[in-house]
């Protein structure tokens, strides 16, 4: 019972924590602009994996996709492949971890096959959320490092005349949303290997064996016997908040109610 | 066809306080936000500030911060601007306009002519 | 706050001329993250409120004749008008849409021989 209890808990936090993850790789707030100490502009400015975008006062929000693939940072384009990874096996693993839950009969498999599928999704579910947490970190590495430099800069102009914005970046919305994530992720796929454990079977049968005593015949027959170690496991299922997603390459809302101040 | 009906023209004595409305007309009010801008005679345009009857966020000019109030009524689509402790220097044609594109001021009131003498 | 600062004050043509007014503000107004630059262009006519003509220094509003013009990046405005007509006659007035509190410059008033 137990087992089942945490190889189910493990799939539901992985099947979150895979959604986190799917959610922060298409959010538009991976960088926001920094609002802290900086001229007060009348612009929103955003940035995500796939696009940037800036939200003015009027509401008016215009998002452009990053078109050249080849003129993008490099750590931009291993962040994504750390993140697609993730989400890759993160799905694989899922559709493993489905045919190796214990509530679920698939014809004979036998208990060896289901927790042999058992730790294959946890390793999956641990090594994808590793690649989102790297992923989010290379991300908000390169956030703290830009961040530096154009506080080093502030304000660059001729002779100190004409000045000039720098616009700041710093940690977005779907940074916290990836680590928790991949957190989740992580976590789930600990308790997927932890129940592979109960699920394997330790049979050890052992042969009849007949001890002569001197004057008695007794027979022992012990029976095989299967070890079953359940790890209960009080672990609430968090919930994430998703990032109003959107996979357009190019947008543009109107000024509307949703201006901000 | 996007209409702001400013009230008209007041004179009042130093020291006294005046409140002018701008009624909407002709979009939903609650999409935009409405700015108010103060033009001297003769003189250039100066930026008061905005109210945002959407979710009632204000953001002031910091040289009229404690001068003007700005407040809305949704039920009548009407932004109205209270303006206190008047001097002479607060006489001046006051504009509401609605924000576009580009945080441009699209639609104009007709302006409101304040008056401010003994 | 960003100083705007409008040139010439004034401007006397003859109607058909072409005519540039400039503006710069005392701070970039080119936003990095769209490449926008936040300038706005108005016209004043007497005892009118001002009217949008261009916004995002070069974007017309719609129904502005094509003859108006706007041009320029960062710290350096243009306004032009390609051929000037009688009822063109007006005070002209760049706004910082950047930066808060949105600013606006003197005015360049044209006047029509």
């Known amino acids: 019972m137990a087992v089942t209890a945490c190889q189910g808990l493990g799939f539901v936090v992985s099947l979150i924590g895979i959604a986190g993850i799917i959610a922060a790789t298409c959010m538009d707030q991976w960088s926001t602009q920094d609002l802290y100490n900086n001229p007060v502009t009348a612009v929103f400015n955003y940035q995500g994996l796939w696009r940037s975008c800036v939200r003015e006062s009027s509401g008016f929000t215009e998002c452009r996709g990053y078109f050249t693939l080849l003129g993008l940072p490099a750590m931009l384009q291993a962040v994504r492949a750390l993140m697609i990874v993730g989400i890759v096996l993160g799905a694989i693993g899922l559709l493993v971890s489905i045919f190796a839950l214990k509530c679920i009969r698939i014809g004979s498999m036998e208990d060896s096959a289901k927790a042999n599928m058992t730790l294959t999704s946890g390793i999956m579910f641990i090594v994808s959320g590793l690649c989102a947490i790297a992923g989010v970190s290379v991300f908000a590495n390169m956030l703290v490092t830009n961040f530096w430099m154009s506080t080093a800069n502030m304000y660059t102009g001729m002779g100190g005349m004409v000045q000039t914005v720098q616009t700041r970046y710093t940690f977005g919305a779907a940074l916290f949303v990836g680590w928790v994530a991949g957190g989740l992720t992580l976590i789930g796929g600990v308790m997927m290997c932890i129940a592979c454990r109960g699920l394997a079977p330790e049979e050890t049968n052992y042969k009849a064996v007949s001890y002569h005593a001197s004057g008695h015949s007794v027979a022992y027959k012990p029976g095989g016997f299967k070890a079953s170690t359940g790890f209960g496991s009080n672990t609430k299922n968090k919930k994430i908040y998703d990032g109003g997603a959107r996979t357009e390459d190019e947008v543009q809302s109107y000024p509307s109610k949703h201006d901000y101040v | 066809e996007v209409q702001l009906q400013q009230s008209g023209p007041v004179l009042v004595k130093p020291g006294a306080s005046v409140k002018m409305s701008c009624k909407a007309s002709?979009?939903?009010?609650?999409?935009?936000?409405m700015n108010w801008v103060k033009q001297s005679h003769g003189k250039s345009l100066e930026w008061i500030g905005f109210?945002?009857?959407?979710?009632?966020?204000?953001r002031y000019n910091q040289k009229f911060k404690g001068k003007a109030t700005l407040t809305v009524d949704k039920s009548s689509s009407t932004a109205y601007m209270e303006l206190n402790s008047l001097t002479s220097e607060d006489s001046a044609v006051y504009y509401c306009a609605t924000i576009y594109f580009g945080n441009s001021f699209a639609n104009w009131g007709q302006g409101t002519l304040v008056t401010v003498s003994a | 706050d960003i100083v705007m600062t409008q040139s010439p004050s004034s401007l006397t043509v003859t109607a058909g001329e072409k005519v540039t007014m400039s503006c710069k503000p005392s701070?970039?107004?080119?936003?990095?993250?769209?490449?926008?630059?936040?300038l706005t262009w108005y016209q004043q006519k007497p005892g009118q409120p001002p009217r949008l003509l261009i916004y995002?220094?070069?974007t017309r509003e719609s129904g502005v004749p094509d003859r108006f013009t706007g041009s320029g990046s960062g710290t350096d405005f243009t306004l032009t008008i390609s051929s000037v007509q009688a009822e063109d006659l007006a005070v002209y007035y760049c706004?910082?849409?950047?930066?808060?509190?949105?600013?606006f410059g003197g005015g360049t008033n044209l006047e029509i021989k």
């Open positions: 701070q970039s107004l080119l936003n990095s993250g769209n490449q926008k630059n936040y």
């Open positions: 109210i945002n009857p959407y979710n009632g966020g204000i």
């Open positions: 995002w220094a070069s």
């Open positions: 002709g979009y939903t009010f609650t999409d935009y936000q």
């Open positions: 706004q910082n849409d950047y930066i808060y509190p949105y600013t």
